[in-house]
């Protein structure tokens, strides 16, 4: 028997520095977690103690903090090289800055193979990008070899900006021939490493003949055997065992997100490459693990540029941006409109001639808007200003919901109206009319939504049984502010871009902004 230790991360999302327990900015260092310096300490400790170790990343290193905003992926290549990752799969967020924003900072600079078997380049891009990422790589580990085959969510064109010259094929269809190719090379220990979410990970384990282990990402899935060490609730045991169609037991793993945990899986193979046993658990990277001094020093050196960036002008406003709780928790506020417009703008994807865009709607809890921005400071808007408006380090995500769920959400928005509570919704691509004289749960008297399957966008009444795409904060997707119906009834959830980054990009693009209060939210006469 031969034993392999797989160390794995996924959905790190730009958390190069240590974070608080909820993966936001570290405030009290003695209680902070994660970060590449701490990760390196643990990785090195395991590398010294165990003979056959692979360090793998399942994608979405890009996007999530000011580190990515400023360094645009160069930080990912630099620190992943420093940690000596063995391989990485491409995630959807690796395409957030377009193909060029992937090629130059990461693909050309990484000293480790970057993998995806189901992304095929066509047209002029084919010769430019070919070879910069690989479908698979065979890695020597001790006296053995291990094949790693990569995959990426086929939803990427709807979630990011890969352009029109990359085709995202079905994962299973694309993986099988590459695994077969590895088999012809007599590679009998094969790991599928990818970024399509836990459900697809399980399907790959079930359907792709020859895959021995699946290391996944995208769904931020936390798996754990025993008592979990922090706040995350396990979605299942670690590893999660799937019985393949040909009768093999295939371990599937994921390690939550944001570099908070290091996935740790030990696999025992027989001489024919069959998995005999698998066990392990994610390791919580808490403050009991010291940060590596040399990596930490490097982080501090790279940090300097971030501090300078946060005070630079992104654009100007010529109107007061009303982000006060007195406005945003009671009525339509222009800061809410600005943020929602930025959220929709960030999700413009012309992927189908029938649709002007795949999504037109935004909802945003008023309680998530934490500060106004005064235009009387020469109109200047900085990252620092936006960090005061959106201080929680969240993301603006894409969900699919039935009309009936949206109706419940809007009823919840005003179920206890008047108490300055955070659940009052700001909107984009939606016209809502409330009658507060009616009883809670029956106050939405009109709810019109902007069409997507149209050449001239117009507002149509919400249909209860129709499925709609909506952009919203991850806080709401996870049921925050009492929006349990969203969490319970959502049909799909894909995590998106960092909230501040979305708004800052929009402001930089527009240069001068003047959002108005324009009748998106109305109250029927006599009730307000």
């Amino acid at each position: 028997a031969w034993e392999l230790t797989i160390l794995h991360t996924n959905d790190v999302h730009s958390r190069l520095e240590q974070t608080s327990e909820d993966s936001s900015k570290c405030v009290n260092a003695s209680r902070c977690m994660g970060g590449v310096a701490r990760l390196f300490t643990k990785v090195q400790q395991i590398r010294r103690a165990e003979p056959n170790v692979l360090l793998l990343d399942a994608g979405d290193q890009y996007q999530g903090t000011i580190w990515f905003t400023v360094y645009k992926g160069a930080e990912v290549a630099h620190f992943m090289n420093a940690l000596r990752y063995d391989a990485m799969a491409l995630g959807n967020h690796e395409f957030d800055n377009g193909v060029e924003g992937l090629i130059e900072p990461l693909l050309k600079e990484a000293k480790f193979p970057i993998l995806s078997a189901n992304i095929k380049a066509k047209g002029p891009l084919a010769s430019q990008i070919s070879g910069l990422y690989l479908p698979y790589k065979v890695l020597p580990v001790g006296d053995e070899v291990v094949g790693i085959v990569g995959y990426t969510s086929k939803e990427t064109p709807f979630l990011s900006n890969p352009g029109t010259n990359l085709v995202f094929e079905d994962e299973i269809t694309a993986l099988q021939p590459e695994v077969d190719k590895l088999k012809t090379l007599n590679v009998n220990k094969i790991i599928a490493l990818g970024h399509s979410g836990f459900e697809m990970d399980k399907l790959i384990a079930q359907k792709v003949r020859g895959v021995d282990v699946v290391v996944g990402g995208h769904s931020n899935t936390f798996l754990y055997t025993g008592n979990p060490p922090s706040k995350e609730v396990p979605a299942g045991k670690y590893p999660f065992i799937v019985t393949s169609d040909d009768g093999r037991k295939v371990p599937v793993v994921q390690a939550y997100a944001f570099g908070k945990y290091l996935g740790y899986l030990k696999i025992e193979f027989d001489e024919r490459g069959n998995v005999i046993s698998s066990h392990g658990n994610p390791i919580l990277l808490n403050s009991s693990i010291p940060e590596d001094p040399s990596i930490k020093a490097d982080i501090n050196k790279w940090r300097i540029k971030l501090d300078n960036y946060s005070t630079q002008e992104l654009g100007k406003t010529i109107v007061y941006l009303d982000g006060s709780s007195q406005s945003c928790r009671f009525r339509e506020c222009n800061m809410g409109n600005l943020i929602c417009d930025a959220m929709i703008n960030n999700n413009l994807r012309h992927t189908d001639e029938m649709f002007w865009n795949h999504v037109s709607m935004c909802i945003l809890n008023g309680g998530g808007i934490r500060s106004p921005i005064d235009e009387r400071n020469n109109g200047t808007i900085t990252w620092e200003n936006l960090a005061a408006v959106l201080p929680f380090g969240g993301t603006f995500d894409l969900v699919q919901l039935k009309g009936s769920t949206l109706k419940k959400a809007f009823e919840h928005s005003v179920h206890r109206y008047g108490q300055s509570t955070g659940e009052f919704l700001q909107v984009g691509g939606i016209h809502v009319v409330y009658d507060l004289s009616r009883k809670p749960g029956d106050r939405v008297v009109k709810l019109d939504v902007l069409c997507t399957k149209c050449r001239v966008p117009s507002y149509d009444p919400l249909k209860m049984d129709e499925v709609y795409k909506v952009i919203l904060p991850n806080f709401l997707a996870n049921g925050g502010d009492g929006f349990q119906m969203i969490k319970d009834e959502l049909l799909r959830h894909d995590s998106g871009d960092q909230d501040i980054n979305v708004v800052s990009t929009y402001i930089s693009k527009m240069k001068v902004i003047y959002p108005a209060v324009e009748g998106r939210i109305k109250f029927s006469t006599g009730s307000h």
């Epitope: 070919s130 790589k137 020597p140 006296d143 590895l182 007599n186 590679v187």
Partner: antibody, heavy 117, light 107 residues
Framework: EVQLVQSGAEVKKPGESLKISCKAS????????INWVRQMPGKGLEWMGR????????NYAGKFKDQVTISADKSISTAYLQWSSLKASDTAMYYC??????????WGQGTLVTVSS | DIQMTQSPSSLSASVGDRVTITCRAS??????LNWYQQKPGKAPKLLIY???RLHSGVPSRFSGSGSGTDFTFTISSLQPEDIATYYC?????????FGQGTKVEIK
């Protein structure tokens, strides 16, 4: 450091047999393919065949199929190329090269075989 | 068998020049195309695999591109130590096959 060290030059007569060797070190010999490549004087490279030492699996190019035998002894990390009856046209430089996935990453220094009466 | 055709068969260029060699496969080989350098009296060395990936330790002045049947190998600024014969090789299908080689000389 990966190294492939080949046996020394050979001068043989037509009809004689010959076995040349390629000893590997610094990597997982048993788990990667050893390829043999011929280069006739003043000519280009020709792939002859390959062996997977752990299982003994072999593949040959059509023109070399019944002309040579490729074998390996994984206990001493050595691959072999042999002829049972040499011809003058077998005069060439022979290289071994290891292949893990896409390409022949590492090459031996070559063994010059001269067949002359 | 897949035929690999390289052009030109030889070229002469000055130090600092950009040098381009092309390789055409008789059928689609996806990106399974490698480039090797062979200096006089020496064994071949891998430069580029899977169309454009630089093998470890290979200078960045060497690059590759292409897809399907047409591939290009470039030396961005020719150095005296680059005098050699360069071979393309397809790894898509057995038997593995090489181009006939391109001899690069200094003017």
């Amino acid at each position: 450091e990966v190294q492939l060290v080949q046996s020394g030059a050979e001068v043989k007569k037509p009809g004689e047999s010959l076995k040349i060797s390629c000893k590997a070190s610094g990597y997982a010999f048993s788990s990667s393919w050893i390829n043999w490549v011929r280069q006739m004087p003043g000519k280009g490279l020709e792939w002859m065949g390959r062996i997977y030492p752990r299982a003994g699996d072999t593949n040959y190019a059509g023109k070399f199929k019944d002309q040579v035998t490729i074998s390996a002894d994984k206990s001493i990390s050595t691959a072999y190329l042999q002829w049972s009856s040499l011809k003058a046209s077998d005069t060439a430089m022979y290289y071994c090269a290891s292949l893990l996935d896409y390409s022949m990453d590492y090459w031996g220094q070559g063994t010059l075989v001269t067949v002359s009466s | 068998d897949i035929q690999m055709t390289q052009s030109p068969s030889s070229l002469s260029a000055s130090v600092g020049d950009r040098v381009t060699i092309t390789c055409r496969a008789s059928q689609d080989i996806s990106n399974y195309l490698n480039w090797y350098q062979q200096k006089p009296g020496k064994a071949p060395k891998l430069l580029i695999y899977y169309t454009s990936r630089l093998h470890s330790g290979v200078p960045s002045r060497f690059s590759g591109s292409g897809s399907g049947t047409d591939f290009t190998f470039t030396i961005s600024s020719l150095q005296p130590e680059d005098i050699a014969t360069y071979y393309c090789q397809q790894g898509n299908t057995l038997p593995l096959t090489f181009g006939q080689g391109t001899k690069v000389e200094i003017k």
